[in-house]
């Protein structure tokens, strides 16, 4: 880890296992004010590897709703709308952090959890040609 | 929000604005044990909309390192390796939660923050604007 200089204005920690348990302000600061979230919203339909978005809901998790991408086809879509058997649609996955209520149902106590989510799909060549 | 039944075994909260500030255990639980992270690691090179991964580091953030995808081409790559400019490589973006040290440099006090990251790229048909 990186050594962080201790600021005298920091809240005290009474946790013996400091900093395993920390205080987190849930008032979310959104850094994306300049980004138009609508911008990429139609890529799922216009992609050569289109996908559907499925709602995954879990009240014991924060955020409770996560959208999972599922590729519509095994192959990719050609310009004429038909499948290209020589190419594959595959999910692009990312590990994200979520907060899991622990103990269960507790409104103010969480544990960090890493989960793998599919964000969208991309079109790949199935075979890597190795050149001698 | 969803009403969560209070469990008698929950830690007490002394925060008057409860549950704006919560306790979070940073001992990460990884739900992805069955997933091999190597599996999708070569998609960035084999995609028709290939991308490069750039390291974004910030010691005031948790996780401190985030990888950002940047599409290599404006167009998409054809089977012969040339770029098709009738199609567009575009980043697939996702909003993720990170922890931001607040006040700055404090090791045990954070605020939740939403940031937009590019996870990979996909190949899309461009929107054609028809002029009347």
């Amino acid at each position: 880890g990186i050594a962080i200089p201790r600021n005298s204005g920091c809240p005290n920690s009474e946790d013996k296992n400091f900093p395993r348990t920390v205080m987190v302000n849930l008032n979310i600061h959104n850094r994306n004010t300049s980004t138009n979230p609508k911008r990429s919203s139609d890529y799922y339909n216009r992609s050569t590897s289109p996908w559907n978005l499925h709602r995954n809901e879990d009240p014991e998790r924060y955020p409770s709703v996560i959208w999972e991408a599922k590729c519509r086809h095994l192959g990719c879509v050609k310009a004429d709308g038909n499948v290209d058997y020589h190419m594959n649609s595959v999910p692009i996955q990312q590990e994200i952090l979520v907060l899991r209520r622990e103990p269960r149902h507790c409104p103010n106590s969480f544990r960090l959890e890493k989960i793998l989510v599919s964000v969208g799909c991309t079109c790949v060549t199935p075979i890597v040609h190795h050149v001698a | 929000g969803i009403a969560i039944p209070r469990n008698s075994g929950c830690p007490n909260s002394e925060d008057k604005n409860f549950p704006r500030t919560v306790m979070v255990n940073l001992n990460i639980h990884n739900r992805n044990t069955s997933t091999n992270p190597k599996r999708s690691s070569d998609y960035y090179n084999r995609s028709t909309s290939p991308w490069n991964l750039h390291r974004n580091e910030d010691p005031e953030r948790y996780p401190s390192v985030i990888w950002e995808a940047k599409c290599r081409h404006l167009g998409c790559v054809k089977a012969d390796g040339n770029v098709d400019y009738h199609m567009n490589s575009v980043p697939i973006q996702q909003e993720i939660l990170v922890l931001r040290r607040e006040p700055r440099h404090c090791p045990n006090s954070f605020r939740l923050e939403k940031i937009l990251v590019s996870v990979g790229c996909t190949c899309v048909t461009p929107i054609v604007h028809h002029v009347a």
């Epitope: 086809h73 095994l74 192959g75 038909n82 499948v83 058997y85 594959n88 075979i127 | 599996r39």
Partner: antibody, heavy 120, light 107 residues
């Protein structure tokens, strides 16, 4: 009930032609990918050709490319395989098979098969 | 083409035994694997797709596992009606290819 019934098999001389048909019933034929898969006597399974739901995409392995043609008539719920320039090694039971999706990747229903024998 | 190497080519086991068949692909097939059962004189029947997903109506004693190039098909408790030849099939890269088959017999 899903049913696939192949017909058109028989004995043919090397260099000859045959046209196989597969009549489909019990499902909306026009929304499923279809394939022909063959099995030489006492041997394993081999893909012969694939066609997507509307006939817009097809695939042939090198062993039959240029000799065999897959097609479909969605109005008649029928799949076809036109086989030309037949060789002894084409002798097999030919199955038509349905993909559970649009395209033809794996096969959830198969016909009973029709035997093609190429011999002089 | 991707080669699918299935083993063993045949096996003999007792009713109630656990039976395991393996299928090795010549390169990563990213879980795009199906398993079929073929009884003598009959057409193949799909049991598993996506390496692990059991088809509707297929008994739970059948299961699939694996990733990358190595996949396994298991019958947890062999039944007399399981006498058949089992095939794996990859659908990652055209042409889709099948394993050579495993003939399962009862001791």
């Amino acid at each position: 009930e899903v049913q696939l019934v192949e017909s058109g098999g028989g004995l043919v001389q090397p260099g000859g032609s045959l046209r196989l048909s597969c009549a489909a019933s019990g499902f909306t034929f026009s929304t499923y990918g279809m394939s022909w898969v063959r099995q030489a006597p006492g041997k394993g399974l081999e893909l012969v050709s694939i066609i997507n739901h509307n006939g817009g995409s097809t695939f042939y392995p090198d062993s039959v490319k240029g000799r065999f043609t897959i097609s479909r008539d969605n109005s008649k719920n029928t799949l076809y395989l036109q086989m030309n320039s037949l060789r002894a090694e084409d002798t097999a039971v030919y199955y038509c098979a349905r993909d559970p999706r649009h395209d033809g990747y794996f096969f959830d229903y198969w016909g009973q098969g029709t035997l093609v024998t190429v011999s002089s | 083409d991707i080669q699918m190497t299935q083993s063993p080519s045949s096996l003999s086991a007792s009713v109630g035994d656990r039976v395991t068949i393996t299928c090795q692909a010549s390169e990563d097939i990213y879980d795009r694997l199906a398993w079929y059962q073929q009884k003598p004189g009959k057409a193949p029947k799909l049991l598993i797709s996506g390496a692990t997903s059991l088809e509707t109506g297929v008994p739970s004693r059948f299961s699939g596992s694996g990733s990358g190039t190595d996949y396994t098909f298991t019958i947890s408790s062999l039944q007399p009606e399981d006498i058949a030849t089992y095939y794996c099939q990859q659908y990652w890269s055209v042409p889709w290819t099948f394993g050579g088959g495993t003939k399962v017999e009862i001791k």
